[in-house]
Amino acid sequence: MMTGTIETTGNISAEKGGSIILQCHLSSTTAQVTQVNWEQQDQLLAICNADLGWHISPSFKDRVAPGPGLGLTLQSLTVNDTGEYFCIYHTYPDGTYTGRIFLEVLESSVAEHGARFQIP
């Protein structure tokens, strides 16, 4: 039975040209995390595997940095980076947990962080 929950940074915003940290946290389970995938709806950004370490998708190599922790740092943001991001936790024995973050990249210098929320 899957008892865990994923807490994410929720809806966040950042300035064009800046950087942002995408963070998720899996709690309420003793399951072992074997791999975390960071994905957009139609594109794998990176994986962090317990054995293989970090692997960044080649097309994002120049502007995605691993960490901190199991999070992901997006750099040199453009308005095209606006959209949904997913942290996908592969765990044993529970299975797969998915968290969602919505990032809005703003032209202006006003960029506030949204509230944290949980996805069961």
Partner: antibody
Framework: QVQLQQSGAEVKKPGASVKVSCKAS????????IEWVRQAPGQGLEWIGV????????KYNEKFKGRATITADKSTSTAYMELSSLRSEDTAVYFC??????????????WGQGTTVTVSS | DIVMTQSPDSLAVSLGERATINCKSS????????????LAWYQQKPGQPPKLLIY???TRESGVPDRFSGSGSGTDFTLTISSLQAEDVAVYYC?????????FGGGTKLEIK
């Protein structure tokens, strides 16, 4: 163009070890994972393990843990798969394959030509 | 580990006819959060390495003829060749692309009747 060039056929005695090489060219070696897969005569495909040349980290099929060792040499863009304590059931064609990112998926997009390993006394 | 089971083991189809190969996984390959199925199909001809045909259960690899199509979701998947050509004689494998180990099905040998 992307190429994976594997070493030549090997004949080994039971209990010996074999080391198969896979030289990559035509792309940035450290940006892609390299997988190893084998195929016994007339049989299907069996995943052995994978290496991340960027980090040096490797992961193995439980069946081969302790007997298979996958390494990578960044200076020569070459991956290696060593299998020890060989037995007759290890007679197979051994393939290396590059893992490309296709949308959301990790896909074995380019393959070596295969290396035949025969284990016989 | 995820176990991939293909059926049938072998299949003989007349030229121009439809060929259907099934693949069943022991665990779901669907990530419902992003609605993606992590399943790939490969074709292998004698003496050659496998060649990617389909990924994401239904997306054709560039250059693959449109007579090849993939369908299914969760644990049940199908590869269909709408009109068999002589060059399609090969062994076809499905692969779990969801989590390591990236296990393969046992293969389906496709021949001409």
């Amino acid at each position: 163009q992307v190429q994976l060039q594997q070493s030549g056929a090997e004949v080994k005695k039971p209990g010996a070890s074999v080391k198969v090489s896979c030289k990559a060219s035509g792309y940035a070696f450290t940006n892609y994972l390299i997988e190893w897969v084998r195929q016994a005569p007339g049989q299907g495909l069996e995943w052995i393990g994978v290496i991340n040349p960027g980090s040096g980290g490797s992961k193995y099929n439980e069946k081969f843990k302790g007997r298979a060792t996958i390494t990578a040499d960044k200076s020569t863009s070459t991956a290696y798969m060593e299998l020890s304590s060989l037995r007759s059931e290890d007679t197979a064609v051994y393939f290396c394959a590059r893992t490309g990112v296709y949308g959301n998926f990790l896909i074995f997009d380019y393959w070596g030509q295969g290396t035949t390993v025969t284990v016989s006394s | 580990d995820i176990v991939m089971t293909q059926s049938p083991d072998s299949l003989a189809v007349s030229l121009g006819e439809r060929a259907t190969i099934n693949c069943k996984s022991s665990q779901s390959l669907l990530n419902s959060g992003i609605q993606k199925n992590y399943l790939a199909w490969y074709q292998q001809k004698p003496g050659q390495p496998p060649k990617l045909l389909i990924y994401g259960a239904s997306t054709r690899e560039s250059g693959v003829p449109d007579r090849f199509s993939g369908s299914g979701s969760g644990t049940d998947f199908t590869l269909t060749i709408s009109s068999l050509q002589a060059e399609d004689v090969a062994v076809y494998y499905c692969q779990n692309d969801h989590r390591y180990p990236f296990t393969f099905g046992g293969g389906t040998k496709l021949e001409i009747k």
